[in-house]
């Protein structure tokens, strides 16, 4: 199955790396230091 992090979610994470948990079909973000929130957009 195609990884959505390389497609429609390519720019989803503002200050972090997109991560796809395939067995749950979940897109989430690993935030850079000091950032948080669903898209790592809060500091």
């Amino acid at each position: 199955k195609k990884n959505p992090c390389t497609a429609e979610f390519q720019n989803f994470c503002i200050h972090g790396e997109c991560r796809y948990i395939e067995h749950l079909e979940v897109v989430t973000c690993n935030c850079h230091q000091d950032y948080f929130g669903e898209r790592c957009g809060e500091k």
């Epitope: 749950l24 079909e25 979940v26 989430t28 690993n30």
Partner: antibody
């Protein structure tokens, strides 16, 4: 308000079938894996099934595998549990639960939202 | 399957006193990425379970800071620094590192 409301429980004879439903509101249902957990009378919690956000992947313990089927309709914000070949040991309160927030890369916060439960009684 | 073993199963506590619940798993709960998916739930009498602690030591939203979780690998602990009347209920540890997800038998906390 984030809410899960189960329905469909009742009294059924051994070998019978039942379909449970769970109506979700107050959050983006399609973004969350969902689970069913049951609790037999005066007993502890037992995980019954989990389904991925898009419904592609489903998981069951051996105790229900082949008899129970979890499904979801993201357009209707609804989760289902089809229960076939029911046994007396399936008698329990069945809870619908959201499989945790997915922020900060912590996709398994645990089951963070639970419904009030629906009672299933299997008896002749 | 991963077996979760809690002790004690019954815990009578005096109001204001500390309380501690142990949870042991039959195998390590650390996954390939180094994450440990061990959670604690509280179930008050007549209510649905509620998430208390996620991933060993993280308090869920709105959970008082008198609750704390600790541990690693196969050995985990839930502590209540000062028990209050509203803490009465059954506490379950649970793992979601391995399928099937499993729960401990539950520890019933009551006031002496």
């Amino acid at each position: 308000e984030v809410q899960l409301v189960e329905s469909g429980g009742g009294l059924v004879k051994p070998g019978g079938s039942l379909r449970l439903s769970c109506a979700a509101s107050g959050f983006t249902f399609s973004s969350y894996p969902m689970s069913w957990v049951r609790q037999a009378p005066e007993k502890g919690l037992e995980w019954v099934s989990t389904i991925s956000t898009g419904g592609t992947y489903t998981y069951y313990p051996d105790s229900v595998k082949g008899r129970f089927t979890i499904s979801r309709d993201n357009a209707k914000n609804s989760l289902y549990l089809q229960m076939n070949s029911l046994r007396a040991e399936d008698t329990a309160v069945y809870y619908c639960a959201r499989q945790g927030p997915i922020y900060y890369g912590n996709y398994y916060y645990g089951m963070d939202v639970w419904g009030q439960g629906t009672t299933v009684t299997v008896s002749s | 399957d991963v077996v979760m073993t809690q002790s004690p199963l019954s815990l009578p506590v005096t109001l204001g006193d500390p309380a501690s619940i142990s949870c042991r798993s039959s195998q390590s709960l650390v996954n390939q990425e180094g994450e440990t998916y061990l959670h604690w739930y509280q179930q008050r009498p007549g209510q649905s379970p509620k998430l208390l602690i996620y991933k060993v030591s993280n308090r869920f939203d709105g959970v008082p800071d008198r609750f704390s979780g600790s541990g690693s690998g196969t050995d985990f602990t839930l502590k209540i620094s000062r028990v209050e009347a509203e803490d009465v209920g059954v506490y379950y540890c649970s793992q979601s590192t391995h399928v099937p997800y499993t729960f401990g038998q539950g520890t019933k906390l009551e006031i002496k």
